[in-house]
C-alpha cells in the first residue's frame, strides 16, 4: 500500500459560523518539516501555503476573506513532507450566517422554569425556509435541527439545571447558509432548595476547541530536545 503521513487536524480559529462579508480563518495543523499545506473545498483545491522555514512550523492558517454562500461548505486539508503526502484531515463544515432575515425565538411555558418541567422552544421566521437550528451559547457544536414552514418546535422534555443558559436560533436556507441569529433567550432552571445552590450553571466556554494551536519551534526547543536525547543515551 502507498505510504502516507498522519492526517492533519483542521479547525476554525474562532468559530465555524462566520457572518457574511467577514473573514474566516481555518488552521491546518500537520507536522514540523511540512513544505506545503493544501486546503480543499468541496473536494477541489482552494488554497496553498508553503511555510517558511518548514522545519520550524507545525501548521498554517488559511484566511477566507469576504465570507459568502459560495465559500460555505465542507473543507479539509492535507500536507506534504518531501514527496510524501498526508492523509486527508477530517471534514470541517464552514457556515455563513447573517443571510436574509432574523428569526424570533420564544420559550414555553416561559424563561423561568423548575427542574423537571417540560420546556419547548419555538423558532419563527416568515421568509421561506424549512430548516431551523437551535444552539446553546458556548455549545455551538451541539446544534439541534427542526423542520417547519415558518415555525419549528424544539421540545426539550423535562429540564434540569444543566439546561440553564442562553439559546439562539437560526433559519437555514441550506446546510451552510444560515439567517441572522435570533435575540438570545435565557433559560433559568431552578431546582429544589437543597440542590439549587450546589447545582453548577453550565459554563459558557466559547468553544475552546475552536482555537488554533500552531506552534513555532524555537532554537531553545531544539536545544532542549537535543539535550533530552543526549541525557536519555547517557542513562542507557
Amino acid at each position: 500500500p502507498k505510504q502516507t503521513l498522519p492526517k492533519p487536524i483542521i479547525r476554525a480559529e474562532s468559530t465555524y459560523m462566520v457572518p457574511k462579508e467577514k473573514q474566516a480563518t481555518l488552521c491546518c495543523q500537520g507536522s514540523y518539516g511540512a513544505v506545503e499545506y493544501q486546503l480543499h473545498f468541496e473536494g477541489s483545491l482552494f488554497a496553498v501555503e508553503r511555510p517558511k522555514p518548514p522545519e520550524r512550523i507545525n501548521g498554517v492558517k488559511f484566511h477566507i476573506p469576504d465570507m459568502n454562500s459560495r465559500k460555505a461548505g465542507r473543507y479539509s486539508c492535507i500536507y506534504r513532507v518531501g514527496e510524501l503526502w498526508s492523509e486527508r484531515s477530517d471534514l470541517l463544515d464552514l457556515v455563513v450566517t447573517e443571510m436574509y432575515d432574523t428569526p424570533t425565538l420564544s420559550v414555553h411555558p416561559g424563561p423561568e422554569v423548575t427542574s423537571g418541567e417540560k420546556v419547548t422552544f419555538y423558532c419563527r421566521l416568515d421568509t421561506a425556509t424549512s430548516m431551523f437550528l437551535l444552539l446553546k451559547e458556548g455549545r455551538s457544536r451541539d446544534v439541534q435541527r427542526s423542520y417547519g414552514k415558518v415555525q419549528a418546535e424544539f421540545p426539550m422534555g423535562p429540564v434540569t439545571t444543566a439546561h440553564r443558559g442562553s439559546y439562539r436560533c437560526f433559519g437555514s436556507y441550506n446546510n451552510y447558509a444560515w439567517s441572522f441569529p435570533s435575540e438570545p433567550v435565557k433559560l433559568l432552571v431552578t431546582g429544589d432548595i437543597e440542590n439549587t445552590s450546589l447545582a453548577p450553571t453550565d459554563p459558557t466556554f466559547p468553544d475552546s476547541w475552536d482555537t488554533c494551536l500552531l506552534t513555532r519551534e524555537t532554537g531553545l526547543q531544539k536545544d532542549l530536545a537535543l539535550w533530552d536525547h543526549t541525557a536519555q543515551n547517557l542513562l542507557r
Epitope: 482552494f46 488554497a47 492558517k61 477566507i64 476573506p65
Partner: nanobody
C-alpha cells in the same frame, strides 16, 4: 474598491509568446493575493496561476513550465508571461484579486476571489 484592467491579449502563432498585464487601482495591491483564470469558448472558467503577497506561486499542471506569474507592487501590476503557446491556450484570460488577505496563502479556487477584471482575449492559431 479595487478595479482590475487586463491588457496584452491578441493573436499569436503556436509556439509563440505573449505577456499579459493586469493594472490594479487602489493602494491594497501589495496586500492582495492575485491570480489568473481563463475561459475557453463554450467551457467553464479554469485556474491558470496564482501568486501570494510574498511572491509564492502555484500553477495549473497544463501551464507549468510554460507560463510565469509575477507582480510589481511598485507599479500595482500583475503579469502573466506565456510562452510555447498552444491552440488549447486560446481563451479569455481574467485577472483576479483576494482583498484583503493575510499571511502567504495562494488561492486556487475561483470562489476565493472577490475582485475580477473584464478579461483579455488570447487566440493561438497558425
Amino acid at each position: 474598491e479595487v478595479q482590475l484592467v487586463e491588457s496584452g491579449g491578441g493573436e499569436v502563432q503556436p509556439g509563440g509568446s505573449l505577456r499579459l498585464s493586469c493594472a490594479a487601482s487602489g493602494r491594497t495591491f501589495a496586500s492582495a493575493a492575485m491570480g489568473w483564470f481563463r475561459q475557453a469558448p463554450g467551457k467553464g472558467r479554469e485556474f491558470v496561476a496564482a501568486i501570494s503577497r510574498s511572491d509564492d506561486t502555484y500553477y495549473a499542471e497544463s501551464v507549468k513550465g510554460r507560463f510565469t506569474i509575477s507582480r510589481d507592487n511598485a507599479k500595482n501590476t500583475l503579469y502573466l508571461q506565456m510562452s510555447s503557446l498552444r491552440a488549447e491556450d486560446t481563451a479569455v484570460y481574467y485577472c483576479a484579486a483576494v482583498v484583503p488577505t493575510y499571511g502567504n496563502n495562494i488561492y486556487v479556487h475561483s470562489a476565493a476571489y472577490n475582485y475580477w477584471g473584464q478579461g483579455t482575449l488570447v487566440t493561438v492559431k497558425p
